[in-house]
C-alpha cells in the first residue's frame, strides 16, 4: 500500500519493434508521476524517465547494450510534488513489468522490398536490410547484422495477370527467381525467425510490380 | 502440447466435394505456416499447399490451384481443405502439418479420402 | 518446378549397419531440405532439417550433410525401431517438393 493519493501502474507491457523498445503502462496519472527503473536479471538498477507524467518510456538505448540478455523494469508511482513521499513500508509504490528478452520477442518490422532486376526469365529481388538501433563498434547493426541466418525472408511472387501465388525463402537478402518471360510479376516479403515461439513473422511488405519504378528490365 | 487433428475424410463420389478440417492446439496457427500434405495408399508423399493464416496468403501445388482451396479460421485455430471435382486419383491420406519456415515440425494423425462410385 | 531424386527407393539392412540415403535437386536449393521418418500407419516425423541440423529428439547416429543440389541421410548403426520409409522434402520454393521415398527394410 502507498500513499494515499497514489496508485501503482499496472498493465506494464513491453512495446518492441526492430528493437525500438518502450515500456507502456497504465493509469494516465493524477495528482502522480512516475519514474521507471530497468535492469538485466544480475545487474544493477538504472532509472530511466524520471518523475514523468507519460505512460511510456523509451528504453532502446538500455536494451540495446545486449540485446540477447532477459530484462526486467519496474515502474514507480509518486504523489506529484512530493517525490519523496514513500508507502507505508518506507518504499515507493512500484510493479514489476514481465520479463523482456529483446532477441527472441522484439517485433519484426514491416520489410520493405528494396529493388527487384529482370535479367532474362531470371528476376532477383532485394529485401531492405533495415538499420536498427543496436550498435557494435560505433555503427549501428543492420537487422541481418543482429540475426544473422537466424532472420529468413519469404517472398511470395505472382504475375500481375493471376492469382496464383508462388512462393521462395531465403536466408540472405536477395532472392533469385524464375519467371516467364514477357509477363509482369508482383513482389510481397515477409520476414520470419524460424526458431522462435512467440513473435515469429513481420506483417507483409507493401506489395511491389514489375512496370513499376522499384524495378530494372534488362535483357 | 502441440497437437493437430484432422477431420472431415470418408467417401465420396467422383466429382464431388469435401472439406477437411484440421484442428490445432497448444500453439496459434496465426504465428506458422499451415500445409496440406497427402499420400495414396501405398505411395510417397505429395505436398497440396500452404496457408499463412495471419495474413490468408495462400500456395498451391499447381496441380491442385483449380479445384483444391486451403482456409483458416484464427478464431477457431483451424486451417481448412476445400476440395472439389474430386477424382478417384484424390483418394489419398490427407495430414496436415505445421511449418516454422524451416521444417514441418508437426503433423496430424491424417484423415482417409475415398473417391468411389 | 524443383525434382527430388531419392535413391536408393529401398534397401536392406541389418541391426548396426551403416545406411546411406541420398537426394538430389534438379537445382540449387541451397539448405532447404528436410529428412522424415515414417511407418506404416503413422505421420512424417522431423529427423532433420536445413540439410544437416538435428531435430530435437532424434537420436545422434542420425546425421545429414550436404547443400546445393546433393544432399544425404546417413543412420550410423541401424537399430530395430529405425526400420521405416524416409523422404527427403526441398521447401525453399513452390511448389515443394518430396523424394520418392526410400523404404529400409530388415536383411
Known amino acids: 500500500s502507498g500513499t494515499t493519493n497514489t496508485v501503482a501502474a499496472y498493465n506494464l507491457t513491453w512495446k518492441s519493434t526492430n528493437f525500438k523498445t518502450i515500456l507502456e503502462w497504465e493509469p494516465k496519472p493524477v495528482n502522480q508521476v512516475y519514474t521507471v527503473q530497468i535492469s538485466t536479471k544480475s545487474g544493477d538498477w538504472k532509472s530511466k524517465c524520471f518523475y514523468t507524467t507519460d505512460t511510456e518510456c523509451d528504453l532502446t538505448d538500455e536494451i540495446v547494450k545486449d540485446v540477447k540478455q532477459t530484462y526486467l523494469a519496474r515502474v514507480f508511482s509518486y504523489p506529484a510534488g512530493n517525490v519523496e513521499s514513500t508507502g507505508s513500508a518506507g518504499e515507493p509504490l512500484y510493479e514489476n513489468s514481465p520479463e523482456f528478452t529483446p532477441y527472441l520477442e522484439t517485433n519484426l518490422g514491416q520489410p520493405t522490398i528494396q529493388s527487384f532486376e529482370q535479367v532474362g526469365t531470371k528476376v532477383n529481388v532485394t529485401v531492405e536490410d533495415e538499420r536498427t538501433l543496436v550498435r557494435r563498434n560505433n555503427t549501428f547493426l543492420s537487422l541481418r547484422d543482429v540475426f544473422g541466418k537466424d532472420l529468413i525472408y519469404t517472398l511470395y511472387y505472382w504475375k500481375s495477370s493471376s492469382s496464383g501465388k508462388k512462393t521462395a525463402k531465403t536466408n540472405t537478402n536477395e532472392f533469385l527467381i524464375d519467371v516467364d518471360k514477357g509477363e509482369n510479376y508482383c513482389f510481397s516479403v515477409q520476414a520470419v525467425i524460424p526458431s522462435r515461439t512467440v513473435n515469429r513473422k513481420s506483417t507483409d511488405s507493401p506489395v511491389e510490380c514489375m512496370g513499376q519504378e522499384k524495378g530494372e528490365f534488362r535483357e | 502440447e502441440v497437437q493437430l487433428v484432422e477431420s472431415g475424410g470418408g467417401l465420396v463420389q467422383p466429382g464431388g466435394s469435401l472439406r477437411l478440417s484440421c484442428a490445432a492446439s497448444?500453439?496459434?496457427?496465426?504465428?506458422?505456416?499451415m500445409h496440406w500434405v497427402r499420400q495414396a495408399p501405398g505411395k510417397g508423399l505429395e505436398w497440396v499447399g500452404w496457408?499463412?493464416?495471419?495474413?490468408?496468403?495462400?500456395i498451391y501445388d499447381p496441380k491442385f490451384q483449380d479445384r483444391f482451396t486451403i482456409s483458416a479460421d484464427t478464431s477457431k485455430n483451424t486451417a481448412y481443405l476445400q476440395m472439389n471435382s474430386l477424382r478417384a486419383e484424390d483418394t489419398a491420406v490427407y495430414y496436415c502439418?505445421?511449418?516454422?519456415?524451416?521444417?514441418?515440425?508437426?503433423w496430424g494423425q491424417g484423415t482417409l479420402v475415398t473417391v468411389s462410385s | 518446378d524443383i525434382q527430388m531424386t531419392q535413391s536408393p527407393s529401398s534397401l536392406s539392412a541389418s541391426v548396426g549397419d551403416r545406411v546411406t540415403i541420398t537426394c538430389k535437386a534438379s537445382?540449387?536449393?541451397?539448405?532447404?531440405l528436410s529428412w522424415y521418418q515414417q511407418k506404416p500407419g503413422k505421420a512424417p516425423k522431423l529427423l532433420i532439417y536445413?540439410?544437416?541440423s538435428l531435430a530435437d529428439g532424434v537420436p545422434s547416429r542420425f546425421s545429414g550433410s550436404g547443400s546445393g543440389t546433393d544432399f544425404t541421410l546417413t543412420i550410423s548403426s541401424l537399430q530395430p525401431e529405425d526400420f521405416a520409409t524416409y523422404y527427403c522434402?526441398?521447401?525453399?520454393?513452390?511448389?515443394?517438393?518430396f523424394g520418392q521415398g526410400t523404404k529400409v527394410e530388415i536383411k
Open positions: 502439418a505445421r511449418d516454422t519456415a524451416a521444417y514441418f515440425d508437426y
Open positions: 497448444g500453439f496459434n496457427i496465426k504465428d506458422y505456416y
Open positions: 496457408i499463412d493464416p495471419e495474413n490468408g496468403n495462400t
Open positions: 537445382r540449387d536449393i541451397k539448405s532447404y
Open positions: 536445413y540439410a544437416p
Open positions: 522434402l526441398q521447401h525453399g520454393e513452390s511448389p515443394f517438393t
